[in-house]
């Protein structure tokens, strides 16, 4: 018979034949042959593989480093990685939670809508027209543009969401 060019799901093609992939939690020891099945071995302690695979090495479980404020939220198994979270009152810097911050800052152009608590991180909002923030802050709101008119001045440079307006003297008409 013709050697296969494609294999079924949970199989892989090697040496012109279809071999079974190893199930999650196991790694490949040897490919199948005409006479033998694929040989797989369970991952060791602190290792995992989360897909049907032909990997020869299992992945190490993530380490939740207490020096970065991390702790284990869910212990890893042979089929799943460890899930880290931050100590109480701290917040993950990303979905992967690789490090922790007390709270995040709002970038220039954004103001603080709600200051962080032990439960929720800082909530930022874009500065609307007429307001600006030129700093990165975890507590400052957007500031209103300076009103040149109330100082008997005129706008020399328009404000943006990151900069205040620049006021200047009114042009005096020459007689």
């Amino acid at each position: 018979p013709e050697p296969p060019t494609a294999c079924r799901e949970k199989q892989y093609l090697i040496n012109s034949q279809c071999c079974s992939l190893c199930q999650p939690g196991q790694k490949l020891v040897s490919d199948c042959t005409e006479f033998t099945e694929t040989e797989c071995l369970p991952c060791g302690e602190s290792e995992f593989l989360d897909t049907w695979n032909r990997e020869t090495h299992c992945h190490q479980h993530k380490y939740c480093d207490p020096n970065l404020g991390l702790r284990v939220q869910q212990k890893g198994t042979s089929e799943t990685d460890t899930i880290c979270t931050c100590e109480e009152g701290w917040h993950c810097t990303s979905e992967a939670c690789e490090s922790c911050v007390l709270h995040r800052s709002c970038s220039p152009g954004f103001g603080v809508k709600q200051i962080a608590t032990g439960v929720s991180d800082t909530i930022c909002e874009p500065c609307p027209v007429g307001f600006f923030s030129n700093v990165s802050s975890a507590f400052e709101k957007c500031h209103p543009w300076t009103s040149c008119e109330t100082k008997d001045l005129v706008v020399q440079q328009a404000g943006t969401n990151k900069t205040d307006v620049v006021c200047g003297p009114q042009d005096r008409l020459r007689a």
């Epitope: 020096n67 970065l68 490090s99 911050v101 007390l102 800052s105 700093v135 990165s136 975890a138």
Partner: nanobody, 116 residues
Framework: EVQLLESGGGLVQPGGSLRLSCAAS???????ELWWVRQAPGKGLERVS?????????YYADSVKGRFTISRDDSKNTLYLQMNSLRAEDTAVYYC?????????WGQGTLVTVSS
């Protein structure tokens, strides 16, 4: 290496005052927003007060408004918290923190105990 070292804590009677200091080293202090945060025994972190990089803006938690004053001296690389009219509920370890507020930019704290 960024280091923040808090000092000035101690035992004080209700109604008394303390001034906490936070000495910074390993970075240029000026321009950084800074916070005082506290943790009471068996409780979570509470954000007490903050001061902007320029020193022009400040924030106080409702629980300390009118009693605590935050200030900074960039020439001495030091942050301060003047605490007046202290109450038993102010008992906590006080920490200072710097943007980006990561866990490794975190001092050892200074213990304030308010008790008669």
């Amino acid at each position: 290496e960024v280091q923040l070292l808090e000092s000035g804590g101690g035992l004080v009677q209700p109604g008394g005052s303390l001034r906490l200091s936070c000495a910074a080293s390993g970075f240029t202090f000026a321009g950084y927003e800074l916070w005082w945060v506290r943790q009471a025994p068996g409780k979570g972190l509470e954000r007490v007060s903050a001061i902007s990089g320029s020193g022009g803006s400040t924030y106080y938690a409702d629980s300390v408004k009118g009693r605590f004053t935050i200030s900074r001296d960039d020439s001495k690389n030091t942050l301060y918290l003047q605490m007046n009219s202290l109450r038993a509920e102010d008992t906590a370890v006080y920490y200072c923190a710097r943007d980006p507020y990561s866990f490794d930019y975190w001092g050892q704290g200074t213990l304030v105990t308010v008790s008669s």
